[in-house]
């Protein structure tokens, strides 16, 4: 058993049929010695008396808010949460496996630039009685500071018969140099509590590996005389690291109809303009990627051909 | 210590071309190592990230773009002195800071070159003959060093009398390649910045 926060404790249980469970001793936070009784949640049934209560925690029915009282007055609370371990593996029931970029990916993180600011998100099908707490650091043995905000519900989607909820959090490394060469990864830890179930999820990454620029901005088309070709130009996104001659991007320019199966024109360039063939009912799209370290491509920025 | 926005001569950057070749060569070599050593811990997640140039050179700080010198997190107190005559420096006007930067890059390359050559000598003794360093990568390191053209004492190639542990050597190769790729990215960024200045 360990303390998650004040008056909230996590009991780690090996979860299998007829498991013996864990013996837990609760102590009432009071100078009083006599006349103390214990109850669980809203029940008025007295579970025991005395300054300490010893319980055998085997299942969720044994978890919850234990309260010690004296003469009708509440003295203190202890909330017990369960953390299940099945076949030596901690449970991951609360969050959905996003399976990208690999299986058992529960947390996904992205950074728009090298400033040390990043966003992580996760998915769940649970809508109520759910809380998250996020901590982060650079390295684990001698951790350096990363400050994370509160996790918030950022999107709701319908997937078949299920509703899916996306939560996200923004974090900022306390003293980040955009030009630094990372040797210690960022560690992100998410504590998830659903009713009386506790789970924790972690992710470890270098900012350079989670870079995904914003789409290029200000796409413009200029038809070329006596030709089916058009010159398309754009600018670096405002959120990208500066100076741009140091933090350079490379671009993919594509002309395609509405369907992905349609034919297309595609060209890659390090410049902020390109010449392509425009077709009726097609769109010109441009996306960006770090020129020197191939992490993710940005989303497309698009303009219609006509 | 940073790079002021100097105006080097237009012909200054044969180094840009060489640095692009360097990044390509080390990326290819790392990819080949990951594929060939698939049953060894050779991915970014599996290896320890070591920098053999730590406390010996200060390329990131010496080559910091002017725009980032206002960022206190970028200003490290490490001080290293370097020799300041190089052929990528196209004119006498070129700043002292730029000379520090380019000589720091040169020292990085020299250190990695020695490590890679020592390692290759060991790998050639491996009866499995599983992996060797790409001669193209070694050649590209050499070309960039020649383009930088700094004079510095030659570092003797390390020789080891004990029987090499090939497993450890291959792990070390992965560590070195990962670190060198990151440094090659920095070098490419610096050369691009200088080229545009």
């Amino acid at each position: 058993i360990w303390e998650l926060k004040k008056d909230v404790y996590v009991v780690e249980l090996d979860w299998y049929p007829d498991a013996p469970g864990e013996m837990v001793v609760l102590t009432c936070d009071t100078p009083e010695e006599d006349g103390i009784t214990w109850t669980l949640d809203q029940s008025s049934e007295v579970l025991g008396s005395g300054k300490t209560l010893t319980i055998q925690v085997k299942e969720f029915g044994d978890a919850g808010q234990y309260t010690c009282h004296k003469g009708g007055e509440v003295l203190s609370h202890s909330l017990l949460l369960l953390h299940k371990k099945e076949d030596g593996i901690w449970s991951t029931d609360i969050l959905k496996d996003q399976k990208e970029p690999k299986n058992k990916t529960f947390l996904r993180c992205e950074a728009k630039n090298y400033s040390g600011r990043f966003t992580c998100w996760w998915l769940t099908t649970i809508s109520t009685d759910l809380t998250f707490s996020v901590k982060s650091s650079r390295g684990s043995s001698d951790p350096q500071g990363v400050t994370c905000g509160a996790a918030t519900l950022s999107a709701e989607r319908v997937r078949g018969d299920n509703k899916e909820y996306e939560y996200s959090v923004e974090c900022q490394e306390d003293s980040a140099c955009p030009a630094a060469e990372e040797s210690l990864p960022i560690e992100v830890m998410v504590d998830a509590v659903h009713k009386l179930k506790y789970e924790n999820y972690t992710s470890s990454f270098f900012i350079r590996d989670i870079i995904k620029p914003d789409p290029p901005k200000n796409l413009q088309l200029k038809p070329l005389k006596n030709s089916r070709q058009v010159e398309v130009s754009w600018e670096y996104p405002d959120t990208w690291s500066t100076p741009h001659s140091y933090f350079s991007l490379t671009f993919c320019v594509q002309v395609q109809g509405k369907s992905k199966r349609e034919k297309k024109d595609r060209v890659f360039t390090d410049k902020t303009s390109a010449t392509v063939i425009c077709r009726k009912n097609a769109s010109i799209s441009v996306r960006a990627q770090d020129r020197y370290y191939s992490s993710s491509w940005s989303e497309w920025a698009s303009v219609p051909c006509s | 210590r940073n790079l002021p926005v100097a105006t080097p001569d237009p012909g200054m950057f044969p180094c840009l071309h060489h640095s692009q070749n360097l990044l390509r060569a080390v990326s290819n070599m790392l990819q080949k190592a990951r594929q060939t050593l698939e049953f060894y811990p050779c991915t970014s997640e599996e290896i320890d990230h070591e920098d053999i140039t730590k406390d010996k050179t200060s390329t990131v700080e010496a080559c910091l773009p002017l725009e980032l010198t206002k960022n206190e997190s970028c200003l490290n107190s490490r001080e290293t002195s370097f020799i300041t005559n190089g052929s990528c420096l196209a004119s006498r006007k070129t700043s002292f800071m730029m000379a520090l930067c380019l000589s720091s890059i040169y020292e990085d390359l020299k250190m990695y070159q020695v490590e890679f050559k020592t390692m290759n000598a060991k790998l050639l003794m491996d009866p499995k003959r599983q992996i060797f360093l790409d001669q193209n990568m070694l050649a590209v390191i050499d070309e960039l060093m020649q383009a930088l053209n700094f004079n510095s004492e030659t570092v003797p190639q390390k020789s080891s009398l004990e029987e090499p542990d090939f497993y450890k050597t291959k792990i070390k190769l992965c560590i070195l390649l990962h670190a060198f790729r990151i440094r090659a990215v920095t070098i490419d960024r610096v050369m691009s910045y200088l080229n545009a200045s």
Epitope: R261, E262, K263, T269 | -
Partner: antibody, heavy 118, light 107 residues
Framework: EVQLVQSGAEVKKPGATVKISCKAS????????LHWVRQAPEKGLEWMGW????????EYAPKFQGRVTITADTSTDTGYLELSSLRSEDTAVYYC???????????WGQGTLVTVSS | DIQMTQSPSSVSASVGDRVTITCRAS??????LHWYQQKPGKAPKLLIY???QSISGVPSRFSGSGSGTDFSLTINSLQPEDFARYYC?????????FGGGTKVEIK
């Protein structure tokens, strides 16, 4: 299976015009760009131009501009290359090639040898 | 027009050898470069597109790399069926242009 089948060999006199065909099968003809590339004996490959069969848009290499016409007949799924004012240096194998991507060639015809000789 | 220069123009190698062919563009073409294999009397066949992207059905011993002006095609462990002529092609701008070709022949 995506396939391009070209018409047979041609022998032409200098100054004449040649028209060769390329019949597509195994895909929707207008879904791919169609190119023509030639190869002189013991020489390299030379791109001549492309057509978008969907709308008839064409683009020619400046070297052949004015002498070459590329057309496409969607009713028969056939592309055509017409080269006029033939000279001996036009002796080559002419290939049609197709792809959903405009700028490289995924599927090739077997080639048509055009010999220009007096 | 963008000129594409291939080297060497021919290379002699044995089965099992590693062969590297290079292609240089007269100006920067990013990764807009493609590789083809051509056997005598046959049409060319696409091997690699956009400098390093492999084609399904093409053996994994063929790999491409490069960007800007310098590119290479590597054949790891040359097989008897790999003896052929290889061409690079740029797609950065029209007109599309090819390299002069590299003949890989049996030593």
């Amino acid at each position: 299976e995506v396939q391009l089948v070209q018409s047979g060999a041609e022998v032409k006199k200098p100054g004449a015009t040649v028209k060769i065909s390329c019949k597509a099968s195994g895909y929707t003809f207008s879904d791919y760009y169609l190119h023509w590339v030639r190869q002189a004996p013991e020489k390299g490959l030379e791109w001549m131009g492309w057509i978008d069969p969907e709308n008839g848009d064409t683009e020619y290499a400046p070297k052949f501009q004015g002498r070459v016409t590329i057309t496409a007949d969607t009713s028969t799924d056939t592309g055509y290359l017409e080269l006029s004012s033939l000279r001996s240096e036009d002796t080559a194998v002419y290939y049609c090639a197709a792809n959903k991507e405009l700028r490289y060639f995924d599927v090739w015809g077997q080639g048509t040898l055009v010999t220009v000789s007096s | 027009d963008i000129q594409m220069t291939q080297s060497p123009s021919s290379v002699s190698a044995s089965v099992g050898d590693r062969v590297t062919i290079t292609c240089r563009a007269s100006q920067s073409i990013s990764i807009n470069l493609h590789w083809y294999q051509q056997k005598p009397g046959k049409a060319p066949k696409l091997l690699i597109y956009f400098a390093s992207q492999s084609i399904s059905g093409v053996p994994s011993r063929f790999s491409g790399s490069g960007s800007g002006t310098d590119f290479s095609l590597t054949i790891n462990s040359l097989q008897p069926e790999d003896f052929a002529r290889y061409y690079c092609q740029q797609s950065n701008s029209f007109p599309l242009t090819f390299g002069g070709g590299t003949k890989v022949e049996i030593k």
